[in-house]
């Protein structure tokens, strides 16, 4: 009956060599595809001489296989009852699934020359770098290749710089032949309701990006939850590709594919500004762009990458405040198209369909030592790309599933 | 409270060499850019050059270049200036002063008296 | 290189009077113009700064106007503690250069 089911569930969730769970743990059976839509200035030179508003298209999917690599260093500590690894990076170009080439050109925001005033603020430094902006003939738009645009390009005005920096600029920079973690995870086997739980991330239990709680690694990855999943559990997980912790709530039932699933989907108050949550406040980490903290559905992860200054948020600027996306023009939120959502069958705690949307902005201000910035009036967050990130289960496995687990509770 | 203490004055050789020290405190020192300028006796100033302590990057006026050495010592908050190949050219009040972010030469030092005579 | 020329040389004013003191640059530098007030045996004092901004705890009777390449430094009213020399400096572009300066004395 029940309790067998039960302790088979118990069994097979397991984080431990010869486990359901394991085997698809370590290289998961879902293919999983990164749509990118990149945003195409339409208007550059209006924008740099007169500070109007930003106008770009969407030009998209180009599609990625991505996590097809197993998790690599995968190390059991029985002590702890906690299983480490790290996840390697890859991403292979599928052409048709996609509209066009990696050599396909876009007009975007030119990243260093954007980040330069961010990150070096003192006048005398942000002069010596306008000189080798003008002499190497950068200025605040530039039109690259999606290869270069993702994956990273020799930036001209970085080359001249004459001390140690990386020259090498790319949104997602380096990526291939580079690793997420170490993540430590617990194995369950002491305790089900901890599996696949965080214990650690690079070594730490908390991020140093963020003061207070907004710091914690709360949850999973976000591939599994702990068994016995009910409708009013909040799922939590964290995402190093936002560098916090988030949650899920239920939303609705679904079948997939004969299994039925619950659709957990990220709240809009989870993107809330600290004043409609105040969860939230110690995600506002500055008050001048976030308008006293009062602007909502973009966040700055600068902290996380360098000091750079980019911003997080859904795509289209969806569930975000009307300041932040008034400087832009052509972009339509759509909340289909657009949330995130995880389908994760309620037995197992296995996410079993998903689709994590995110958009990679830069936020761009007037430096009047830079002078292809000093004609700037105010700061724009510039929508770069966004991403739709999908999984789901292929038909034998969820036959094989429906066999195995949700067969046997019928 | 900000404060930029310089060495004592000098009374050097022509052909020797010279290093000034500026001692910072008050503030993070290697946020702000050390500047060192040049004041000959009822004269001008004359911007010498810039060092940002953070990175160790440095700016010379041309006019200056081979004659002056900008460096820093983080850790005891300190910036220098050492001078080469001295001529009576270069006998002049030297000073040190710090930006403030946007702003140029917010504090200066006190100034150190170079001397160069045989 | 910008070069900056100051003028007058000197001025001599009686108190209460109006100062003012010119800089003209050999290339537009926006407003990209600082003002320092050195008295004698001292470091200069940073007056205004860029963007006709003066600093915090200087007397409003200071002030400067002008935009790319003409530039004024006005003292409303002198007062005997003005007399000085005066320095104005474009931070627009590397080498910073810094005007001839004017000797402002006491009628």
């Known amino acids: 009956g029940d309790m067998l089911i039960e302790k088979t569930i118990k069994r097979e969730v397991v984080l431990e060599e010869g486990t359901t769970a394991f085997k698809n743990w370590v290289k998961t059976g879902t293919t999983v595809y990164r749509q990118f839509w990149i945003f195409d200035v339409q208007n550059p030179d209006d924008v740099a001489k007169n500070s109007s508003k930003i106008k770009v298209k969407q030009r998209g999917p180009y599609t990625y296989r991505v996590r097809y690599l197993a998790k690599e260093n995968i190390t059991q500590d029985p002590e702890d009852h906690t299983v480490s690894f790290v996840q390697p990076n890859g991403a292979i170009f599928e052409p048709s699934l996609s509209v066009g080439t990696e050599d396909d050109n876009f007009t975007v925001l030119n990243l260093a020359v954007a980040a330069a005033p961010h990150i070096y603020q003192n006048s005398f430094v942000q002069v010596v770098l306008n000189s080798l902006i003008k002499k190497s003939k950068s200025s605040m738009f530039q039109t690259r290749s999606l290869k270069e645009l993702l994956w990273g390009y020799k930036d001209p005005f970085l080359s001249l710089v004459p001390y140690p920096i990386s020259t090498t600029v790319g949104v997602f920079y380096p990526y291939n032949d580079t690793v997420d973690g170490v993540y430590k995870v617990f194995n369950g086997k002491d305790n089900i309701s901890k599996v696949a739980i965080i214990e650690s991330y690079k070594g730490k239990r908390n991020l140093s990006y963020w003061p207070s709680y907004c710091d914690m690694i709360n949850g999973t990855d976000a591939a599994s939850f702990p068994p016995f999943v009910e409708k009013s559990r909040t799922l939590r997980f964290f995402s190093s590709d936002i560098c916090r912790s988030i949650y899920a709530v239920f939303g609705s039932e679904i079948d997939l594919k004969g299994i039925p699933v619950y659709r957990f989907v990220l709240p809009a108050n989870a993107f809330a500004s600290p004043l409609q949550n105040p969860d939230n406040h110690c995600f506002c980490t500055e008050k001048v762009i976030s308008n006293n903290c009062t602007s909502y559905g973009v966040l700055d992860i600068g902290k996380c990458k360098e000091g750079k200054p980019v911003y997080i948020s859904l795509p289209h600027f969806l569930h975000a405040s009307p300041d932040v996306s008034e400087p832009i023009e052509g972009l339509h939120p759509n909340e289909d198209e657009h949330r995130t959502y995880l389908d994760v069958e309620p037995i197992t705690g296995f996410t079993l369909q998903f689709a994590k949307r995110l958009q990679v902005n830069i936020l761009v201000k007037p430096a009047r030592k830079i002078e292809a910035l000093k004609n700037l009036k105010r700061p724009y967050i510039v929508p770069i790309l966004w991403l739709n990130e999908t999984g789901t289960i292929g038909d034998e496995k969820a036959e094989m599933f429906k066999t195995q687990v949700t067969g046997k509770i019928k | 409270q900000i404060q930029l203490v310089q060495s004592g004055p000098e009374l050097v050789k022509p052909g020797a060499s010279v290093k000034i020290s500026c001692e910072t405190s008050?503030?993070?020192?290697?946020?702000?850019?050390m500047h060192w300028v040049k004041q000959s006796h009822g004269k001008s100033l004359e911007w010498i050059g810039g060092?940002?302590?953070?990175?160790?990057?440095?700016k010379y006026n041309q006019k200056f270049k081979g004659k002056a050495t900008l460096t820093v010592d983080k850790s005891s908050s300190t910036a220098y200036m050492e001078l080469r190949s001295l001529t009576s050219e270069d006998s002049a009040v030297y000073y040190c002063?710090?930006?403030?972010?946007?702003?140029?030469?917010?504090?200066w030092g006190q100034g150190t008296l170079v001397t160069v005579s045989a | 290189e910008t070069t900056v020329t100051q003028s007058p040389a000197s001025l001599s004013v009686a108190t209460g009077e109006k100062v003012t003191i010119r800089c003209i640059t050999s290339?537009?530098?926006?407003?990209?113009m600082n003002w320092y007030q050195q008295k004698p045996g001292e470091p200069p004092k940073l007056l205004i700064s860029?963007?006709?901004t003066l600093r915090p705890g200087v007397p409003s009777r200071f002030s400067s106007g002008g935009y790319g390449t003409d530039f004024v430094f006005t003292v409303e009213n002198m007062l005997s503690e003005d007399v000085a020399d005066y320095y104005c400096?474009?931070?627009?572009?590397?080498?910073?250069?810094f005007g001839a300066g004017t000797k402002l004395e006491l009628k």
């Open positions: 002063a710090r930006d403030r972010y946007d702003v140029w030469f917010a504090y």
């Open positions: 008050g503030h993070t020192f290697t946020e702000y850019t």
């Open positions: 400096l474009q931070s627009d572009n590397l080498p910073l250069t």
């Open positions: 290339t537009d530098i926006d407003d990209d």
């Open positions: 860029e963007g006709n």
């Open positions: 060092i940002y302590p953070n990175n160790g990057a440095t």
